[in-house]
């Protein structure tokens, strides 16, 4: 799997999980989240050569097409596969609230 | 929806469905499919700017991050959303077989 266990241990130009820390205030302009101040969002990036973690039959076909037609602009792209939620603390006035924001953290990637 | 109805009628640099005809023999080296000789596979391509058809909370966050940090390399990618199967005819010896190949045709796209 193209997850932290594999991608963070290997130098990989191909599609893989990349570390990305996001600071809510600085990077998103969100002042309303009290805790955490930021989080490891991660992201997916890298080339999708033939048979590299292809997600669907279409992405396998596209990847093969690209190998045979290297001048073509049609190729699969490295995107998130498994995502996890993030629990945050924010305030309604002086009252603390806990909320779970879905699909905030990328755990693994795929070529799609 | 970033589908043929929208994308094939508009000149769009952003993430959209693009037409792509694949000839099985010429483009994939597949000689085993008798009919059709090729098909409209289509593919997804184009930029994923802020709020352009974001798929998940993470892709919205990434797109916002990219807007505020334009020098960043972390950005969502244009990939297939809805896929359809393709029915093919091939031969086992002299015996014709009909098979449905899943996820062969891209019908719409998303930024993920």
């Amino acid at each position: 799997a193209l997850d932290a266990a594999y991608c963070f241990r290997n130098v990989q130009d191909n599609c893989c999980l990349r570390p990305l820390y996001i600071d809510f205030k600085r990077d998103l302009g969100w002042k309303w989240i009290h805790e955490p101040k930021g989080y490891n969002a991660n992201f997916c990036a890298g080339a999708c050569p033939y048979l590299w973690s292809s997600d669907t039959q279409h992405s396998r076909v596209l990847s093969l097409y690209n190998t045979i037609n290297p001048e073509a602009s049609a190729s699969p792209c490295c995107v998130s596969q498994d995502l996890e939620p993030l629990t945050i603390l924010y305030y309604i006035g002086k009252t603390p609230k806990i909320e779970q924001l879905s699909n905030m953290i990328v755990k693994s990637c795929k070529c799609s | 929806a970033l589908d043929a109805a929208y994308c094939f009628r508009n000149v769009q640099d952003n993430c959209c469905l693009r037409p792509l005809y694949i000839d099985f023999k010429r483009d994939l080296g597949w000689k085993w499919i008798h009919e059709p000789k090729g098909y409209n596979a289509n593919f997804c391509a184009g930029a994923c700017p802020y709020l352009w058809s974001s798929d998940t909370q993470h892709s919205r966050v990434l797109s916002l991050y990219n807007t505020i940090n334009p020098e960043a390399s972390a950005s969502p990618c244009c990939v297939s959303q809805d896929l359809e199967p393709l029915t093919i005819l091939y031969y086992i010896g002299k015996t014709p077989k009909i098979e449905q190949l899943s996820n062969m045709i891209v019908k719409s796209c998303k930024c993920s």
Epitope: L28, W30, W32, Y90 | Q57
Partner: antibody, heavy 120, light 108 residues
Framework: QVQLVQSGAEVKKPGSSVKVSCKAS????????ISWVRQAPGQGLEWMGG????????NYAQRFKGRVTITADESTSTTYMELSSLRSEDTAVYYC?????????????WGQGTLVTVSS | ETVLTQSPGTLSLSPGERATLSCRAS???????LAWYQQKPGQAPRLLIY???SRAPGIPDRFSGSGSGTDFTLTISRLEPEDFAVYYC?????????FGQGTRLEIK
């Protein structure tokens, strides 16, 4: 510079619903928090509720709960306030406003206001 | 809900004079959950002060806010002709946000 542009005046019958829009520009919509405030003719200001558009977290004044819905469409940078079961006392100017960043906060930019008249 | 009571209801002063507007909360707001607005006829409110004492961008320094707990004050040091309007205080310590009933500042 943030600009909030609201939809035009509405005349509604008692018992019906009204949906007022508020389109934001000049700032990243996904970083904004929007509140809705109303003002009856010759009266003071009354807060109805607020929303964090990117995560759809909304907070409503108890007296409007069940009657008001605040939503956001990120693709058009627009916030909507829908008020149902209208009565004559809902006749007011309805304002959207962006807060300084929190769900409950001071409001630094305001729309031009939308007059909603409820009359049979 | 937190009730805000503004006084006086109407204040009649001349340009150049000092105006002192009061806002009292029915429960403690702490030191930073109060804002002041100015509203002129046919216009939307305009934020003057937030966090009890911080001036909003572009607000002249003749406007100042003070107070904490339950008692807050808006002071206009030297009244200009354009300052005659209705002033509202607003609390955002608790939901729902509430506003005072307003103080009308009129030319004497």
């Amino acid at each position: 510079q943030v600009q909030l542009v609201q939809s035009g005046a509405e005349v509604k019958k008692p018992g019906s619903s009204v949906k007022v829009s508020c389109k934001a520009s000049g700032y990243t919509f996904s970083s904004m928090v929007i509140s809705w405030v109303r003002q009856a003719p010759g009266q003071g200001l009354e807060w109805m509720g607020g929303v964090i558009p990117i995560v759809d977290i909304a907070n409503y004044a108890q007296r409007f709960k069940g009657r008001v819905t605040i939503t956001a469409d990120e693709s058009t940078s627009t916030t909507y306030m829908e008020l149902s079961s209208l009565r004559s006392e809902d006749t007011a100017v309805y304002y959207c406003a962006s807060t300084l960043g929190l769900v409950l906060d001071a409001m630094d930019y305001w729309g031009q206001g939308t007059l909603v008249t409820v009359s049979s | 809900e937190t009730v805000l009571t503004q006084s006086p209801g109407t204040l009649s002063l001349s340009p150049g004079e000092r105006a002192t507007l009061s806002c009292r909360a029915s429960q403690s707001l702490g030191s930073s959950y109060l804002a002041w607005y100015q509203q002129k006829p046919g216009q939307a409110p305009r934020l003057l002060i937030y966090g009890a004492s911080s001036r909003a961008p572009g607000i002249p320094d003749r406007f100042s806010g003070s107070g904490s707990g339950t008692d807050f004050t808006l002071t206009i040091s030297r009244l200009e002709p354009e300052d005659f309007a209705v002033y509202y205080c607003q609390q955002y310590a608790d939901s729902p946000i509430t506003f005072g009933q307003g103080t009308r500042l009129e030319i004497k």
